[in-house]
Amino acid sequence: VSPTFQVVNSIAPVQECSTQLDIVIVLDGSNSIYPWDSVTAFLNDLLERMDIGPKQTQVGIVQYGENVTHEFNLNKYSSTEEVLVAAKKIVQRGGRQTMTALGIDTARKEAFTEARGARRGVKKVMVIVTDGESHDNHRLKQVIQDCEDENIQRFSIAILGSYNRGNLSTEKFVEEIKSIASEPTEKHFFNVSDELALVTIVKTLGERIFALEA
């Protein structure tokens, strides 16, 4: 802008406003997640806080276990209301395997593509929810590095329910899920005692995600 307040030249901003994020939620859908409606309740509480639309925040959901399913793409729905209806209908796909590296890698390579609605220049956020050590743990380090290289901010949530039900040590599991989270870990990693407690972290998780918009 010139001293006389005339537009000298203009470059269209990459982001129209500061509330743009592309968020992909990566859900563990293996059998040990129980009850599943605790996950859909968590999704509902988190998503209803978001201003979802093609020029605002976009949300996609991926579910994994033994394999990976794109529940819906980033550009599938254009309002919070539509996303809430769709998220409520997500069914647990089951399975005994927890292929977390595969889930994250598929989200990075596929869910965050322009073909599925990702927008150039918009901050990418991944939220990973799981309740067990991955069966493809050997791939995790590289997969996380690939996310890092593509500037994907990662929030990871460890559900301790199946460990507590079986009186098992959570130490190794927690370390693995911490390793998925972006730095600083204490702002990007959450753990909950069981599936029913997922809703207790929604407010803090939401605030931390939206802090990225600033």
Epitope: N31, P35, W36, Q92, G94, R96, S162, R165
Partner: antibody, heavy 124, light 108 residues
Framework: EVQLVQSGAEVKKPGESLRISCKGS????????IGWVRQMPGKGLEWMGI????????RYSPSFQGQVTISADKSISTAYLQWSSLKASDTAMYYC??????????????????WGQGTLVTVS | EIVLTQSPGTLSLSPGERATLSCRAS???????LAWYQQKPAQAPRLLIY???RRATGIPDRFSGSGSGTDFTLTISRLEPEDFAVYYC?????????FGQGTTVEIK
């Protein structure tokens, strides 16, 4: 639509063998546990055992261990309950049901969300 | 194993009335892992409630569950003609599943 379809009613003599089936559809059958439940005439429900069709991992109720065999053929999405030598006391309705939950790592939990229509077995 | 005792054995009520069914466990049911099923004559059981208080898909809101520890309740706020049936509670917190003996809700 999730469905569990069981084989038809059977009339057998004591000492005979029998295998009844439960075929799942409308969901990934290899990814959910299937349980078997007995209901003797005019009585309540008793859990017999459970199988994971994906790898045939099986757990039995202590009351039924050694009395029956639970198996599965994942290629045809079917679970089975079999007896090698039937007794009159095996006369009952047998239900299969899908477990919403898990039975891994020695800990089992979950509810049965979908049920088959039942197979009546009469031994006399 | 956990033994579940249901009471009363039979409940005689009229349509429109409130039904309260009790299920008592011989020891605490972990994580309130208790379900309720309805069974009508010549039909398979149908899931109503799980985790003590969560209604299964498609179950009308006149059915509600409550309780924790050893005492659980199924309430039918206003009985409809199709609600007359046998109701079973089931616990699943101990690596096995046990059922109560059932409560019959019959038309008075």
């Amino acid at each position: 639509e999730v469905q569990l379809v069981q084989s038809g009613a059977e009339v057998k003599k004591p000492g005979e063998s029998l295998r009844i089936s439960c075929k799942g559809s409308g969901y990934s059958v290899t990814s959910y546990w299937i349980g078997w439940v007995r209901q003797m005439p005019g009585k309540g429900l008793e859990w017999m055992g459970i199988i994971y069709p994906g790898d045939s991992d099986t757990r039995y109720s202590p009351s039924f261990q050694g009395q029956v065999t639970i198996s599965a053929d994942k290629s045809i999405s079917t679970a089975y309950l079999q007896w090698s030598s039937l007794k009159a006391s095996d006369t009952a309705m047998y239900y299969c049901a899908r477990l919403q939950g898990d039975c891994s790592g020695g800990t089992c939990y979950g509810h049965f969300d979908y049920w088959g229509q039942g197979t009546l077995v009469t031994v006399s | 194993e956990i033994v579940l005792t249901q009471s009363p054995g039979t409940l005689s009520l009229s349509p429109g009335e409130r039904a309260t069914l009790s299920c008592r466990a011989s020891q605490s049911v972990s994580s309130s892992y208790l379900a309720w099923y309805q069974q009508k004559p010549a039909q398979a059981p149908r899931l109503l409630i799980y985790v003590a208080s969560r209604r299964a898909t498609g179950i009308p809101d006149r059915f509600s569950g409550s309780g924790s520890g050893t005492d659980f309740t199924l309430t039918i706020s206003r009985l409809e003609p199709e609600d007359f049936a046998v109701y079973y509670c089931q616990q699943y917190g101990t690596s096995s599943w046990t059922f109560g003996q059932g409560t019959t809700v019959e038309i008075k």
